[in-house]
Each structure stands twice: as C-alpha cells, then as structure tokens.
Amino acid sequence: ARNGDRCPLGPGRCCRLHTVHASLEDLGWADWVLSPREVQVTMCIGACPSQFREANMHAQIKMNLHRLKPDTVPAPCCVPASYNPMVLIQKTDTGVSLQTYDDLLAKDCHCV
Amino acid sequence: ARNGDRCPLGPGRCCRLHTVHASLEDLGWADWVLSPREVQVTMCIGACPSQFREANMHAQIKMNLHRLKPDTVPAPCCVPASYNPMVLIQKTDTGVSLQTYDDLLAKDCHCV
C-alpha cells in the first residue's frame, strides 16, 4: 500500500468507505420513496491523520495549520471523492417512477 | 438568505470561508517556495448543523443518520465546494518558475 493509504492509527480507524444499513424511516424518505424500503448507504467515515489519503494541496495545508493552530483550524475531514448512482422508486404526480440519484452513495473517500 | 444559509448556532459559527495568515514555514514550504513569503490561506471552517449548506443528498442522509447513530456516523463536515487558483514562485532544477496551483485556496464552502 502507498504511504497515503496505510493507517497509522490501526486497521479500519482511518478514513474509508463504510456501509450503513438504513430504512426509509431512518433517512426521512418514507413519505415519498416506495422502494427499496431498506438502503445500504455507503459513506466516508474515519480519521484523517497526516498524509493519509490527502485529496489535494489544500488538505496538506490544512493539516499543517491544524498542527500549529488546533483550536482555530480543524483537521482534514473524510468525505466522498466520488459517488455511485442509485435508483429509487418513488411516487410522482402522475404515478410511480424509477429515479436515478447521482450524489447519494459514496464510491470512494479522501481527506480534505 | 436561503434557509440553508442561515446559521442556527449564531453568526459566524457555521461552515464558511475563513482567511488564515500563514508563513511558508507554517505551511512547510520554506525549502521550495521563494515567494510569496506570507500566504492568505482561505479555508472552510465551522459547524454543519441540519440543512445548513448541504452539498447534496448524501449530506442530507449523513445528517439524518448522524442524528440516529451519533457514535457511528459523524455529522457532515465543512469542506471547499470550489477552489481559487494561486501562483507560487518556486525553485526548480533549472532555476525559478511561476507555478499555478488550482486546488490550494478554498473559494466557497459547503457541508458534506
């Protein structure tokens, strides 16, 4: 693994893709989504230690300034680098439709 | 202001653009950047309460699941929505060059 992919905090502690099982009720969608009633939500969770999956130079700067001024500048944060599309079957004015959402499920993660 | 831009925690507490004054030493760039010696680093800092500057549907999901499972799912986090380019004058093998960096300074912020 590249240095930027090896977690210094121990396996699974750093920024990575997690799957969270959620019902439509959990998501607040129960009144407009028909199916599926359970969704496997992929999201980015974990710590962003120095040099770990840094998205860009801004993330490097942020980490350096966080070290100097931890009360002012937060550490970089684990967010989606890209998304997977997802289909929801939902009620519409005219009936029922299959709707694609492109920004719903994280595909991979990085630190920003 | 749209509802998503009004901070419920009080002025300046929510996710927004901040300017942090930093020297090349602060940034760890002193050995390869000649100028400028001081940089006004714009970065995204602040809390991401519910519905505040949500980047997309993923951010909505994350907030809903954070409310339900705060120990498992973190709240959305304040990150750059876009960047401003910046020019650095730097040392190279052949001398000195002007180099543009597109991902260095945050231009605006949102919650993901």
């Epitope: 199916s35 359970e38 997802m86 289909v87 029922v96 299959l98 694609t100 | -």
Partner: antibody
C-alpha cells in the same frame, strides 16, 4: 436464502382468468418490489408490471392495462398476478422476480408457472 | 418506452472462445443495465447489474461494460455450461424492457 416459489401450471379456456401466486422467503417481503415477467414459447422476455408489497402501488405494462391486476398479501409474504380475458397468445411461462433494488437489479426469480390457454 | 436491441441474435462458438454480445438502448439509460443467462426450461439468472457489477456467485469470466446507450457483455473464455441464451434489460425507467436475446450455441 432468498427464494420465490410460484404456484403450479394452469390450463385455461379463452376468456377465462388465471391467478398465479409467488411466495417470498429469506428476506423482508415489504422491503422490495415484485415484477412479473412472461415468456411465450420460443420467445423473449416481456415485462408485465411491478408492485410494491409495502403500499400496494403498481405499474403495469400499457398493453396489459385493464386485463392485469397485481396484489400482495403481506401476512403470507405472497404476491399475486391475475390476468383476465385470456387469449391464446397469453400462453407463456409467467415469472415473478424481486426488484429493482437500489442498483436497479432484478436479482431473484421464481421458477416460473406455465399457463396454457386453449379451447 | 425504451427499446433494447441486442446483437447478434445468435453466435456459434467453441469452448475457450471469447464471446462478446452488445446491447443498445434507444435512449440513455445511465448505467442501469443488467445481463441475464437463461437455459432451456429454467428461469433467467442475473449475471451483471449496473452495467458492470458482477452478481455474487457469478464466475469472473463474465464481465460487463458501457454506459448511456451502448453496452457489452463479454465471456472471456467460454465454458461448456455457458451455452445458453443471454438477455439485456434496462431498469432506468418504467416500463422495464428486455433485449431480444442472444443464443450462444456450440460450433
């Protein structure tokens, strides 16, 4: 494991009705929809419609609208497809299939029910 | 309705051959295309979903690619159990529609 088990073969006269059942097991029946797909002898697959067990909402193929009714019984985790005013060209194997899921997948199929329409 | 056009309608191939089947949608369907294998007297079996994701338990010699309107199913090295009919199916919008099928026969 996830399974869909359909009712047995039927022989019907033209003008009659048929009701095919599809019993689900191995997953929460109300979490996903059920499609009905048919296949005439030697032909390809034809989608007939979809129902969600959760609310009973349906979508039917236009050519079958008015002749087909899809229902579910959540107490027995069973889906039903009734086709009325049968014609000889309704002779086919009728399948139930789970989905589409969040990745638009129709992943588990019943074994099929042969319906023969003959005078 | 979205029309799905599969080609070829049949292909003769030998064990070990690489086989490619294409499917074209009459309008863009994002990546919402699935591929099924069907053997005589049996229900269709899901091989590939979301254009390129391999269904659990399906051998890795099957692969899918494409997005928008043009999609491909590839069998990298044909095995005796792969002789069957293959269907593509879109689930981008209702009504869900299938391609006409491609029969893979022994040469």
């Amino acid at each position: 494991q996830v399974q869909l088990v359909q009712s047995g073969a039927e022989v019907k006269k033209p003008g009659a009705s048929v009701k095919v059942s599809c019993k689900a097991s191995g997953y929460t029946f109300t979490d996903e929809g059920i499609n009905w797909v048919r296949q005439a002898p030697g032909q390809g697959l034809e989608w007939m419609g979809w129902i969600t067990a959760y609310s009973g909402d349906t979508v039917y193929a236009q050519k079958l609208q008015g002749r087909v009714t899809m229902t579910t019984d959540t107490s027995t985790s069973t889906a039903y497809m009734e086709l009325r005013s049968l014609r000889s060209d309704d002779t086919a194997v009728y399948y139930c299939a789970r989905g589409p899921g969040q990745y638009a997948d129709v992943d588990v199929w019943g074994q099929g029910t042969m319906v023969t329409v003959s005078s | 309705d979205i029309q799905m056009t599969q080609s070829p309608s049949s292909v003769s191939a030998s064990v070990g051959d690489r086989v490619t089947i294409t499917c074209r949608a009459s309008q863009g369907i994002s990546s919402w295309l699935a591929w099924y294998q069907q053997k005589p007297g049996k229900a269709p079996k899901l091989l590939i979903y979301a254009a390129s994701s391999l269904q659990s338990g399906v051998p890795s010699r099957f692969s899918g690619s494409g997005s928008g309107t043009d999609f491909t199913l590839t069998i990298s090295s044909l095995q005796p159990e792969d002789f069957a009919t293959y269907y593509c199916q879109q689930a981008n919008s209702f009504p869900i529609t299938f391609g006409g099928g491609t029969k893979v026969e022994i040469k």
